[in-house]
C-alpha cells in the first residue's frame, strides 16, 4: 500500500494536524492542536447543523411563516432543519417550500386528474367524449354523461364536455 495521502474521512487538516470535524448538531469552537482536541459546542435552540463540519455558526431553523400559508410539517432538531408544508387548500411554489399558492381549480370542461397536495398543484385534464364537468373545482373529476337508455328515455339534447345530455320520454306512436 501507498503511504497516507490525506486525513481520514471525518477529519480536516489545519496547522499540520488532522483534527476531528464536529459531529452533526455541533459547531466548531476551536481547532485541535498537538495538545488539545477539536472543541465543539451543541447548536442552540432553533439552530442546526446536519453534517460533520467545521462551521463556527449553526444554521437557523427555517421559519414556516403562516402569512405565506406555511405550517410546520416536521419540527427541526439540532441535526435537522424544520420542514414546512402548506395549509389545507394551498401548495408549495418551490421544492424549498418558501411560500404557498392556492390550489388551482379545473374550469368547466375539465376534470381533476390528480388532486393537489401540499407540494403539488391540481392537475386537470379535458373531459373526453362521453364525459363532462360543469363546475370549476379542485376536486371534481369529469362525470360520465347520463345513459338515457338505462332509464328507458331518449336523448333530447346531446351532451358536451361542459354539459350532461338531456333525456326525455320516447315519442308514443299515435294509433
Amino acid at each position: 500500500p501507498e503511504p497516507p495521502t490525506a486525513c481520514r474521512e471525518k477529519q480536516y487538516l489545519i496547522n499540520s494536524q488532522c483534527c476531528s470535524l464536529c459531529q452533526p448538531g455541533q459547531k466548531l469552537v476551536s481547532d485541535c492542536t498537538e495538545f488539545t482536541e477539536t472543541e465543539c459546542l451543541p447548536c442552540g435552540e432553533s439552530e442546526f447543523l446536519d453534517t460533520w463540519n467545521r462551521e463556527t455558526h449553526c444554521h437557523q431553523h427555517k421559519y414556516c411563516d403562516p402569512n405565506l400559508g406555511l405550517r410546520v410539517q416536521q419540527k427541526g432538531t439540532s441535526e435537522t432543519d424544520t420542514i414546512c408544508t402548506c395549509e389545507e387548500g394551498w401548495h408549495c411554489t418551490s421544492e424549498a417550500c418558501e411560500s404557498c399558492v392556492l390550489h388551482r381549480s379545473c374550469s368547466p370542461g375539465f376534470g381533476v386528474k390528480q388532486i393537489a397536495t401540499g407540494v403539488s398543484d391540481t392537475i386537470c385534464e379535458p373531459c373526453p367524449v362521453g364525459f363532462f364537468s360543469n363546475v370549476s373545482s379542485a376536486f371534481e373529476k369529469c362525470h360520465p354523461w347520463t345513459s338515457c337508455e338505462t332509464k328507458d328515455l331518449v336523448v333530447q339534447q346531446a351532451g358536451t364536455n361542459k354539459t350532461d345530455v338531456v333525456c326525455g320520454p320516447q315519442d308514443r306512436l299515435r294509433a
Epitope: P1, Q11, Q23, E37, T38
Partner: antibody
C-alpha cells in the same frame, strides 16, 4: 483530557474467546480510527487491526483474520476487540490506541498518540 | 509487511551517557518512522515523529535522524527517567510494523 480506559485482566482457557473494551473520553470518538495492538511477554508490539468508529469499517492484520472481531458502540464511546480460539501464544498485553494522522514536511503519516493502559490476557489450561 | 530491525536489543548505560539506537526498514519508507518510549508496566508513548520531528514536551536531549531505510534515535545525556524500552514503527504502509525494541538498562 484525552483518555482510553481498558477493561481488566482476563484468564482464559485454550479454545475460549476474550473480549476487551476500550472506553474513550475527552475527544470526538467517531472522529479518529482506533488501533488494537498486543505485546507478548518480553516481545515487541504487534498491530492487530483498526476500526473506524464512525462507520464500523475494520481492517485486520492477515495473521488475525478470521479470529479477531473489532466492534464499537458510539453511544458509550467504546471500542471492543474480541479474539476467539485462544492459544497459549495469545498470552499478551492488549492495547487500544488512537490513530492521529499528521502532516509534516509535505507528507502525511499516522501516529498512535494516545494509548490505553493495557489489558493482560493470560491463556492457560 | 515491512520488516523493522532494531539494534541493539538491549544496552547498559549510565546517567549522563550518550546513547544511540538504530532502526532499519526492509524497504524504503521515506521518513515515515515514529519512535516510542515504553517504561516498565506502562503503555508506549510517542517520542519522535516522523524520523526527526520532536513533539513539544519531549526533552531536547532526544533526537532522531535518517530517511529511506536507516534511522537512529539518540539520547545525548541519559537521565534516570529515560531507562526503559524504545521501539521504532513505520507508518508508511498498512500494517504498521514495529522494531523488536531496545531495552536501555542502568549499568
Amino acid at each position: 483530557q484525552v483518555q482510553l480506559v481498558q477493561s481488566g485482566a482476563e484468564v482464559k482457557k485454550p479454545g475460549a474467546s476474550v473480549k476487551v473494551s476500550c472506553k474513550a473520553s475527552g475527544y470526538t470518538f467517531p472522529g479518529y480510527y482506533m488501533y488494537w495492538l498486543r505485546q507478548a511477554p518480553g516481545q515487541g508490539l504487534e498491530w492487530m487491526g483498526w476500526i473506524n468508529p464512525d462507520s464500523g469499517d475494520t481492517n485486520y492484520a492477515q495473521k488475525f483474520q478470521g479470529r479477531v472481531t473489532m466492534t464499537r458502540d458510539t453511544s458509550i464511546s467504546t471500542a471492543f476487540m474480541e479474539l476467539s480460539r485462544l492459544r497459549s501464544d495469545d498470552t499478551a498485553v492488549y492495547y487500544c490506541a488512537r490513530e492521529k494522522p499528521r502532516y509534516f514536511d509535505s507528507f502525511y503519516y499516522y501516529l498512535m498518540d494516545v494509548w490505553g493502559q493495557g489489558t493482560t490476557v493470560t491463556v492457560s489450561s | 509487511d515491512i520488516q523493522m530491525t532494531q539494534s541493539p536489543s538491549s544496552l547498559s548505560a549510565s546517567v549522563g551517557d550518550r546513547v544511540t539506537i538504530t532502526c532499519r526498514a526492509g524497504q524504503n519508507i521515506a521518513r515515515h518512522l515514529n519512535w516510542y518510549q515504553q517504561n516498565p508496566g506502562k503503555a508506549p508513548k510517542v517520542l519522535i515523529h516522523p524520523a526527526s520531528s520532536l513533539p513539544s514536551g519531549v526533552p531536547s536531549r532526544f533526537s532522531g535522524s535518517g530517511s529511506g531505510t536507516d534511522f537512529s534515535l539518540t539520547i545525548s545525556s541519559l537521565q534516570p527517567e529515560d531507562f526503559g524500552t524504545y521501539f521504532c514503527q513505520q507508518s508508511y504502509s498498512t500494517p504498521p510494523t514495529f522494531g523488536g525494541g531496545t531495552k536501555v538498562e542502568l549499568k
